[in-house]
């Protein structure tokens, strides 16, 4: 049967991800790209009500409609883009990118014929210095009462999806409480998702600026016509070349037969939406686009019989659950999975600074990505964690 | 060595079940992906279907005249490999070759066991 | 599912013959190309992996080429025991097939 978001359900550009719905089956959400909004992005936004702008722009209701009022420099529906420069002003001092930590570049008529609009946590000419007092504070308390509500219920509500608001209490971020909390650098997570270096941002501590600091940044993906192949082709006993690349995988290892392994500390767990006996049934695809996303080697963990520890995850039991329910027993909706990280290729390439040295500083990243709305995994996930490893039981 | 044996062909009727085993010795065997080969007799090879490390997930997969009727599983704490045949045919009458796939191609294939389907 | 087409189904040959054997695939399969040699009652033994590569013990007198859905393996010069049935075998994409095998026999 084709995945919900195979039939490519979202229209105008929408994302589409797959969710659970309420009877436990496996759905899809379209994140929309604004001004269209609708289950399937189909209806077109008359009023600030109906627009989603990303999280901290707001709305502001025009003659032509609502639009995401953009912050200077930016631009474009969901303010992604970089504002071309005034007509009549040269872009060239603009080319260089010569604002640092996310600022925004403008173009002027004098020397230096440019100006950076910086950051919230940034100054200086060129945005180098972090301010002694950030532009914006960062939010001590979550403002908005009603998100006091909505934590935990397993929907990410955008509007609560703040640091000030512990991402919506994890509900945007896998769980995960502050994908940043290692971070001293204050304003990394608004930098996460800009697909500029960030050098004050680039340690592990503060989950390597998504790769924006390395040759091709995360925009070096893995080629699409070698996707499918090598999800096809991962770990399955033959070195593909073409598949042993960080952004695809490193083919599951089969070019590295003779290269010892180097796991990172403890163990990978993942809550995903899906039976075992489903997710197993597809887990090389499974393993390969994780490892993409990781830029680095994952594989099932395996207990002392040398089984893949894929565990059945059921539906936490409300009170009232129905006699027949429990009579059935619990009701499977999910697998919980244990993963290990094999650094053994992400050291041995060029950039071998970027490997995630522990399974913590994974679920991480995965967090951060969630919570950015940039998890590109098809892979239904509730939530991600890092556990200390323990030696399998034996049975 | 590297060593691989085949064992558990015989005669069986059509519709009878049939389970192959292939005991590895001299490798790694859990590390390995494993394939099943058949040849029909006087007749050229067919690949039967593989099985990937249980680290990856133990997946298998099956050429289309077999796939629902035989099933391939691995146990890599007694070192084998089975091949589990049901609602077994006249045409799937074979030497059955199990085969240790390598990255670098340093294949090893077992000596194979016959199975004869006949009534 | 991807067609392995071999050709001739069978030749004669004389040792020291040069011997062609072609092989066709019914889709690209980049270079996914693979030569076995098999002897009656035998096991298949590998020759060449990846269309041209020539596996470690066999003797330099095979060799392959080709990519896309032309193959060729060539013997340069016939020995005489290289006579034996020779299949190739695609596994870009599962199911992995085989061709239906060329025979080598002695003229």
């Known amino acids: 049967a084709l995945s919900p978001c195979e039939s490519q359900p979202c229209q105008h550009g929408g994302q589409c991800r797959h969710s659970l719905g309420r009877g436990g089956g496996l759905t899809f959400t379209c994140h929309c790209v604004p001004p269209f909004w609708g289950l399937r992005c189909e209806r077109v936004a008359r009023s600030c009500r109906e627009l989603q702008c990303p999280v901290g722009i707001p709305c502001q209701q025009t003659a032509r409609g609502p639009r995401c009022a953009c912050p200077p420099g930016l631009s474009g529906p969901s303010c992604r883009v970089s504002r071309a420069s005034p007509s009549g002003a040269t872009n060239a001092s603009c080319a260089s990118a010569p604002c640092l930590h996310g600022g925004s570049c403008l173009p002027v008529q004098s020397v230096p014929f440019f100006r950076c609009v910086c950051a919230p946590g940034w100054g200086g000419p060129r945005c180098e210095t972090p301010s002694a007092a950030p532009e914006v504070p960062e939010e001590p308390r979550c403002p908005r009462a009603a998100c006091q509500a909505k934590r935990g219920d397993q929907n990410c509500d955008r509007e609560c999806n703040t640091p000030g608001c512990g991402w919506d209490g994890g509900d945007c971020s896998l769980n995960v409480d502050d994908p940043w909390r290692q971070c001293e650098a204050l304003q990394c997570w608004r930098l996460f998702n800009n697909s500029r270096c960030d050098p004050a941002c680039s340690s592990p501590a503060c989950l390597y600026d998504n790769f924006d600091c390395y040759s091709g940044g995360r925009d070096r993906t893995c080629n699409p016509v070698y996707e499918k192949y090598c999800a096809d082709h991962f770990a399955d006993g033959r070195c593909d070349q073409g598949c042993n690349t960080e952004e695809c995988g490193w083919d599951g290892l089969d070019c590295a037969s003779e290269v010892p392994a180097l796991l990172a500390r403890g163990v990978l767990v993942l809550t995903v939406l899906l039976p075992p006996e489903e997710l197993l049934r597809s887990s090389a695809d499974f393993l390969q686009r994780l490892s993409a996303i990781l830029r680095t080697s994952l594989r099932f963990r395996l207990d002392a019989r040398g089984q893949a520890m894929v565990f059945p995850y059921h539906r936490p039991s409300p009170g009232s659950e129905s006699r027949v329910r429990r009579e059935l027993g619990p009701e499977v909706i999910g697998s919980v999975v244990m993963l290990e990280i094999d650094n053994r290729l992400c050291l041995q390439s060029a950039e071998n600074d970027h490997c995630f040295p522990d399974a913590q500083s994974a679920a991480d990243y995965l967090g951060a990505l969630s919570a950015v709305e940039r998890l590109d995994f098809p892979y239904p996930l509730r939530d991600v964690r890092g556990e200390p490893l323990e030696a399998p039981e034996q049975s | 060595q590297v060593q691989l044996v085949e064992s558990g062909g015989g005669l069986v009727k059509p519709g009878g079940s049939l389970r192959l085993s292939c005991a590895a010795s001299g490798f790694t065997f859990s590390t390995y992906v494993m394939h099943w080969v058949r040849q029909a007799p006087g007749k050229g090879l067919e690949w039967v279907g593989r099985i990937r490390a249980n680290a990856y997930g133990g997946a298998a997969d099956y050429a289309a005249p077999v796939k629902g009727r035989f099933t391939i599983s691995r146990d890599d704490s007694k070192n084998t490999l089975y091949l589990q045949m049901n609602s077994l045919k006249t045409e799937d009458t074979a030497v059955y070759y199990c085969?240790?796939?390598?990255?670098?191609?340093?294949?090893?294939w077992g000596q194979g066991t016959l199975v004869t389907v006949s009534s | 599912d991807i067609q392995m087409t071999q050709s001739p189904s069978s030749l004669s040959a004389s040792v020291g013959d040069r011997v062609t054997i072609t092989c066709r695939a019914s889709?690209?399969?980049?270079?996914?190309l693979n030569w076995y040699q098999q002897k009656p009652g035998k096991a298949p033994k590998l020759l060449i992996y990846?269309?041209?590569n020539l596996q470690s013990g066999v003797p330099s007198r095979f060799s392959g080429s080709g990519s896309g859905t032309d193959f060729t393996l060539t013997i340069s010069s016939l020995q005489p025991e290289d006579f034996a049935t020779y299949y190739c075998?695609?596994?870009?994409?599962?199911?992995?097939?085989f061709g239906q095998g060329t025979k080598v026999e002695i003229k």
């Open positions: 085969a240790r796939a390598e990255a670098r191609y340093r294949d090893v």
């Open positions: 075998q695609q596994d870009y994409h599962t199911p992995f097939t």
């Open positions: 990846a269309a041209s």
């Open positions: 889709q690209s399969i980049s270079s996914h």
